[in-house]
């Protein structure tokens, strides 16, 4: 499932190249393993900002598919309470390109520990 999430992220990256979306998104670029579930939830919410601002059906569908995959993959450890992690609003705001790159990194963390 996480491997498919990466495929969707690559697809989103390709789709947004032809668009002008100047949104900045809360991005965790240095995820601590003990905060990865919290960080993932932030990434999943911020991803929907891209969908909200693009108005593009392909982006909507890809974002939604990614969220389905990620939430289902998260469900086994999504209820774990991680303490001492940053709230989404405390993260740095980055452009979409940097956001997607950091998103790929956190997904790889999940792949490596599954």
């Amino acid at each position: 499932n996480w491997v498919n999430v990466i495929s969707d992220l690559k697809k989103i990256e390709d789709l947004i190249q032809s668009m002008h979306i100047d949104a900045t998104l809360y991005t965790e670029s240095d995820v601590h393993p003990s905060c990865k579930v919290t960080a993932m939830k932030c990434f999943l919410l911020e991803l929907q900002v891209i969908s909200l601002e693009s108005g593009d059906a392909s982006i909507h569908d890809t974002v939604e598919n990614l969220i389905i995959l990620a939430n289902n993959s998260l469900s086994s450890n999504g209820n774990v309470t991680e303490s001492g992690c940053k709230e989404c609003e405390e993260l740095e705001e980055k452009n979409i390109k940097e956001f997607l790159q950091s998103f790929v990194h956190i997904v790889q963390m999940f792949i490596n520990t599954s």
Epitope: L45, Q48, N71
Partner: antibody
């Protein structure tokens, strides 16, 4: 396109309960949340609470905590809001709205879009 | 209980620029985003501005949001008759974990 269709108008007696439904289409219902908001005649908007259709987590506004129950049925992509011990000042249009939050920590950065058409609930003896 | 204060009414003529304010207490608006919803007569509200100043796709750039200190504003330039509606600001109260709406502003477009 994303659409939320609500159940029809209700007339209830004081002390009774009402259950409003909100059927979603055009998106994966079980991956997101639903917020409920009401509007008394000629008044402003008031948030009642949120439910995650993904995991059933709920967060109710303090004011309604002991009278409201929100549920979802993912097999029919429908959200429900039940309000008990109705009083005349509960007379309002009740709206459901798609909320991007599937997890509680996402709620503080969420938004409500789109909204259902509203359900008029009249409480009168 | 946190409160967001909006003027009950505002008006302007077609083509004009109008501003609707939304003010909160010192502690709230400064560190929380403001959202704006438009409610046309007899219809459900619609998301207009989110996170202080961002527009969802499909919302004309005549609508803009801003925030300074404890006050947020919605500006509508090139006013049109179809902008006649109620406008609500909202924010998330992190202490209560609840969404709070302003009282709403009824915008009238004078012909």
């Amino acid at each position: 396109q994303v659409q939320l269709v609500q159940s029809g108008a209700e007339v209830k007696k004081p002390g009774a309960s009402v259950k409003v439904s909100c059927k979603a289409s055009g998106y994966s219902f079980s991956s997101f949340g639903i917020s409920w908001v009401r509007q008394a005649p000629g008044q402003g908007l008031e948030w009642l609470g949120w439910i995650s259709a993904f995991n059933g987590y709920t967060k109710y506004a303090q004011k309604f905590q002991d009278r409201v129950t929100m549920t979802t049925d993912t097999s029919t992509s429908t959200a429900y809001m039940e309000l008990r011990s109705l009083r005349s000042d509960d007379t309002a249009v009740y709206y459901c709205a798609r909320d991007p939050a599937a997890w509680p920590l996402q709620q503080s950065l969420a938004w409500f879009d789109p909204w259902g058409q509203g359900t008029m609930v009249t409480v009168s003896s | 209980q946190s409160v967001l204060t909006q003027p009950p009414s505002a008006s302007g003529t077609p083509g004009q620029r109008v501003t609707i304010s939304c003010s909160g207490s010192t502690s709230n608006l400064k560190r929380n985003y403001v959202y704006w919803y438009q409610q046309l007569p007899g219809t459900a509200p619609k998301l207009l501005i989110y996170r202080d100043r961002r527009r969802p796709s499909g919302v004309p750039d005549r609508f803009s949001g801003s925030k300074s200190g404890t006050s947020a504003s919605l500006a509508i330039s090139g006013l049109r008759s179809e902008d006649e509606a109620d406008y609500y600001c909202a924010w998330y109260d992190r202490e209560l974990s609840e969404w709070v709406f302003g009282g709403g502003t009824k915008l009238t477009v004078l012909q």
